[in-house]
Interface confidence: low
């Protein structure tokens, strides 16, 4: 999906009002310095691409993020403010339902959510320009 035509300001508002708090809740009990940020993004469409990948794609050691509150709110924000996004996610959602049955918070998941926090912060920087 090409995130170029999303309403970035609306997504930013959704992040600031709710998603950021849900990410903090998920990470509660971990030190802010515990994980190094190794994932980066260059502009807002790039950031959303990486955010979508980390939030919804299953990875080794962490297959449970999609059902978290921050993930559901992220999905809603992208569906509302990115034209045509929800249509591209129908097959992915069905696959997700089959693949994710248990909800376990692993260290890998905590690290992954820490990366997400970094990506969201970069998405929200006012100096960040669209290409």
């Amino acid at each position: 999906y090409d995130f170029t035509n999303c309403d970035f300001e609306k997504i930013k508002a959704a992040y600031l009002s709710t998603i950021s708090k849900d990410l903090i809740t998920y990470m509660s009990g971990t030190k802010s310095t515990e994980f190094n940020n190794t994932v980066s993004c260059s502009n807002r469409p790039h950031c959303l691409t990486e955010i979508q990948s980390l939030t919804f794609n299953p990875t080794a050691g962490c297959a449970s993020l999609a059902k978290e509150m921050f993930a559901m709110k992220t999905k809603a924000a992208l569906a509302i403010w990115c034209p045509g996004y929800s249509e591209t996610q129908i097959n992915a959602t069905q696959a997700m339902k089959k693949a994710r049955k248990s909800k376990v918070t692993t260290n890998k998941c905590l690290e992954q959510v820490s990366q997400l926090q970094g990506l969201w912060r970069r998405f929200n920087r006012p100096l960040l320009k669209q290409q």
Epitope: V39, E111, L127, L128, Q131
Partner: antibody, heavy 121, light 112 residues
């Protein structure tokens, strides 16, 4: 045309200082992470330092930490490398490079022509 | 720190013949996001390096399809299906999984 042009190289004595500059054009400079890479005469490539697009994160190789400072001015489309306490082993061609962004995984997709720094007495 | 090791050091190839360069990392370059942070560059004689392949197997813009990258985890390969005269130079692999980023020592490719 996407272009990176380095300047500021030259001959300097051990212990001396030099400031390298890189002028970027043909792309939205503020969207990209930037990196300095060097190559000693007849040797391979060595990563020196990287700076993220909004200067939020800065990284250095151990060999230059505490002596070199990377900085950028997004308003002027310029990247700099301040080199202090220079040593003979810092002699190299220094390349200004562009990080390819999230899709390219931090690979360096644009390189300048390079500028020679010679540290010798 | 991650150490990158390339083999062979040099390679002499007949035009039209295939060539293969190996790159090994001291630890896995696979990130939890599913991407593997390994890239290939070519430095032609007297020129600056240029990006050939990023994230193991993706050809950079303008790179001919005779170049291909493969591998996973710690073992990677750059293949040239049919070497041409313009392919001479030194090939480098690089990891950007974590700082300090690091390059392999290089493989010099020349024409027989």
């Amino acid at each position: 045309e996407v272009q990176l042009v380095e300047s500021g190289g030259g001959l300097v004595q051990p212990g001396g200082s030099l400031r390298l500059s890189c002028a970027a054009s043909g792309f939205t400079f503020s969207n990209y992470d930037m990196t300095w890479v060097r190559q000693a005469p007849g040797k391979g490539l060595e990563w020196v330092s990287s700076i993220t697009f909004a200067s939020s994160y800065i990284y250095y190789a151990d060999s230059v930490k505490g002596r070199f400072t990377i900085s950028r001015d997004n308003a002027k489309n310029s990247l700099s490398l301040q080199m202090n306490s220079l040593r003979a082993e810092d002699t190299a061609v220094y390349y200004c490079t562009r990080g390819g962004g999230a899709y390219h995984g931090g690979s360096l997709d644009v390189w300048g022509q390079g500028v020679l720094v010679t540290v010798s007495s | 720190d991650i150490v990158m090791t390339q083999t062979p050091l040099s390679l002499s190839v007949t035009p039209g013949e295939p060539a293969s360069i190996s790159c090994r990392s001291s630890q896995s370059l696979l990130h939890i996001n599913g991407y593997t942070y390994l890239h290939w560059y070519l430095q032609k004689p007297g020129q600056s390096p240029q990006l050939l392949i990023y994230l193991v197997s993706h050809r950079a813009s303008g790179v001919p399809d005779r170049f291909s990258g493969s591998g996973s985890d710690t073992d990677f390969t750059l293949k040239i299906s049919r070497v041409e005269a313009e392919d001479v130079g030194v090939y480098y692999c690089e990891q950007t999984l974590q700082t300090p980023y690091s390059f392999g020592g290089g493989t010099k490719v020349e024409i027989k």
